[in-house]
């Protein structure tokens, strides 16, 4: 796969993942009422990071925001923080990667600068994806713990026995947002890795040029970049196509040096 394709695909995958992270963060269904083995209620509860909602069988849905910071569980705060950090890093990653894209020409930016920017955006995407995956996993772990605690309470007699009035414990299970978050985090991570791989292909490799230059000249003369236009084919105006026959040409080939990773 060419550097441009790898970089472009990495960018697109990261972008999709990033959009998914935003969607997951905003979604209300992080946890949903467990309907299995529960009395059938005409009310369905679900909760997000920012508000909790109740949908009645009447069709009426009411959502209430968590208007307190201090009263919220520390774990929920931590998950919020991780998702926001993931989004912020993703935004920066996208901005950096736009300028780093090989198919986009910006002034006289050379490949080494683009390589650095590609690597930076790749790392940002990787961290963003990891933040999302950790955030979602922490929330899922919290749900599992609470679920089994609720189950234990339900079967230990706290739900009411004998002549006592029964109360129903609302148990929560994984909501759609968790799955969106896991997939989105994974995509962002994969996209970031692809950007990092593309970065290797953008990095100029001087030793490669010397070897090619030495054999092509046939003369025992020290290599000077651009000094043997006629015999080496390394003139400043020549294009990669002359060395890599049939190779694809990118828009900024005039500025870029050929490397052994260009057409992997």
């Amino acid at each position: 796969m060419s550097v441009t394709a790898c970089q472009g695909l990495g960018f697109v995958v990261s972008l999709i993942g990033f959009a998914g992270i935003i969607a997951a963060t905003c979604m209300d269904q992080w946890s949903t009422q467990d309907l299995y083995n529960n009395p059938v209620t005409a009310v369905f509860n679900y909760q997000g990071l920012w508000r909790s909602c109740v949908r009645e069988s009447s069709g009426f849905t009411e959502c209430r925001g968590y208007f307190t910071l201090l009263g919220l569980p520390a774990m929920l705060q931590a998950v919020r923080a991780l998702m926001i950090v993931g989004i912020v890093l993703g935004v920066i990653g996208i901005l950096v990667s736009i300028f780093a894209l090989k198919c986009i020409r910006i002034g006289s930016m050379d490949d080494s600068a683009k390589a650095k920017m590609t690597l930076t955006s790749g790392i940002l995407f990787i961290i963003s994806g990891i933040c999302a995956i950790i955030g979602v996993s922490v929330f899922a772990n919290m749900l599992v713990t609470n679920f089994w605690m609720s189950t234990a309470n339900m079967y230990s007699g706290m739900g009411g026995m004998g002549g006592m009035v029964q109360t129903v414990q609302t148990r929560y299970t994984f909501g759609a947002a968790l799955f969106v978050g896991w997939v989105a985090g994974g995509l962002t991570l994969i996209g970031g890795v692809m950007m990092c791989i593309a970065c290797r292909g953008l990095t100029p490799d001087d030793s490669n040029f010397k070897a090619v230059s030495y054999h092509a000249s046939g003369q025992n003369v020290a290599y000077r970049p651009g000094g043997f236009k006629a015999s080496t084919g390394f003139g400043s105006n020549t294009r990669n196509k002359k060395i890599y026959d049939g190779g694809a040409r990118t828009e900024d080939d005039e500025q870029s040096h050929p490397t052994k990773y260009d057409y992997v």
Epitope: Q33, P39, V40, T41, A42, V43, N45, Y46, Q47, S52, C53, V54, E56, S57, S58, G59, F60, E62, R64, G160, V165, Q166, T167, V168, T170
Partner: antibody, heavy 118, light 113 residues
Framework: QVQLVQSGAEVKKPGSSVKVSCKAS????????IEWVRQAPGQGLEWMGL????????NYNEKFKGRVTITADESTSTAYMELSSLRSEDTAVYYC???????????WGQGTLVTVSS | DIVMTQSPDSLAVSLGERATINCKSS????????????LAWYQQKPGQPPKLLIY???TRESGVPDRFSGSGSGTDFTLTISSLQAEDVAVYYC?????????FGQGTKLEIK
């Protein structure tokens, strides 16, 4: 304004079936559940089941499962309740009602008296 | 099924006096998600369908006089008519709106003393 108009009174033989209709007007029929409730003479109210006219989804009281069928026709904004294998104890006024906030029943049909007699 | 038990079965109150009807459910009707109790109160006069008075245990339906009020939470609920009027003579029902199948209390007949 919301209106639910039910079909007329029926006299049925034991073992037969009855189908009561409930025509809705004044609101988006497919957006609200229609519930069916019955009341035997001098007795209390008994919930029979519901239908979501938009999806066709139903939920029945176990007591009537297998005997009651609730359907809806969106084109005519009409809900139907069919009760089969009628017995004398099924003699009652059958009401349709539209669901409201809190799953309560704010709008009711005028009621349909079904008499089961041999 | 959820059992709804109303008390008393019948009640005679003088005009202008306070009338109180109680309703007890066999399970809590409180939904923790929105802190609302899914209980409704209906008034039924002879030959008429029931009329919704109160939903969410304490929210008065529009058009219902403010002398009607609902209170309670969990399993114990109360319908109060602060000043009984002649037109309030009817049978009153409470209803579980939380669990399927929805169930009604047996009814309380309110009369004028």
């Amino acid at each position: 304004q919301v209106q639910l108009v039910q079909s007329g009174a029926e006299v049925k033989k034991p073992g037969s079936s009855v189908k009561v209709s409930c025509k809705a007007s004044g609101y988006a029929f497919s957006n609200y559940l229609i519930e069916w409730v019955r009341q035997a003479p001098g007795q209390g109210l008994e919930w029979m089941g519901l239908i979501n006219p938009g999806s066709g989804g139903t939920n029945y009281n176990e007591k009537f499962k297998g005997r009651v069928t609730i359907t809806a026709d969106e084109s005519t904004s009409t809900a139907y309740m069919e009760l089969s294998s009628l017995r004398s104890e099924d003699t009652a006024v059958y009401y349709c009602a539209r669901v409201y906030y809190g799953n309560s029943f704010a709008y009711w049909g005028q009621g349909t008296l079904v008499t089961v007699s041999s | 099924d959820i059992v709804m038990t109303q008390s008393p079965d019948s009640l005679a109150v003088s005009l202008g006096e306070r009338a109180t009807i109680n309703c007890k459910s066999s399970q809590s009707l409180l939904n923790s998600g929105n802190n609302k109790n899914y209980l409704a109160w209906y008034q039924q006069k002879p030959g008429q369908p029931p009329k919704l008075l109160i939903y969410w245990a304490s929210t008065r339906e529009s058009g219902v006089p403010d002398r009607f009020s609902g209170s309670g939470s969990g399993t114990d609920f109360t319908l109060t008519i602060s000043s009984l009027q002649a037109e309030d003579v009817a049978v009153y029902y409470c209803q579980n709106d939380y669990f399927y199948p929805f169930t009604f209390g047996q009814g309380t007949k309110l009369e004028i003393k």
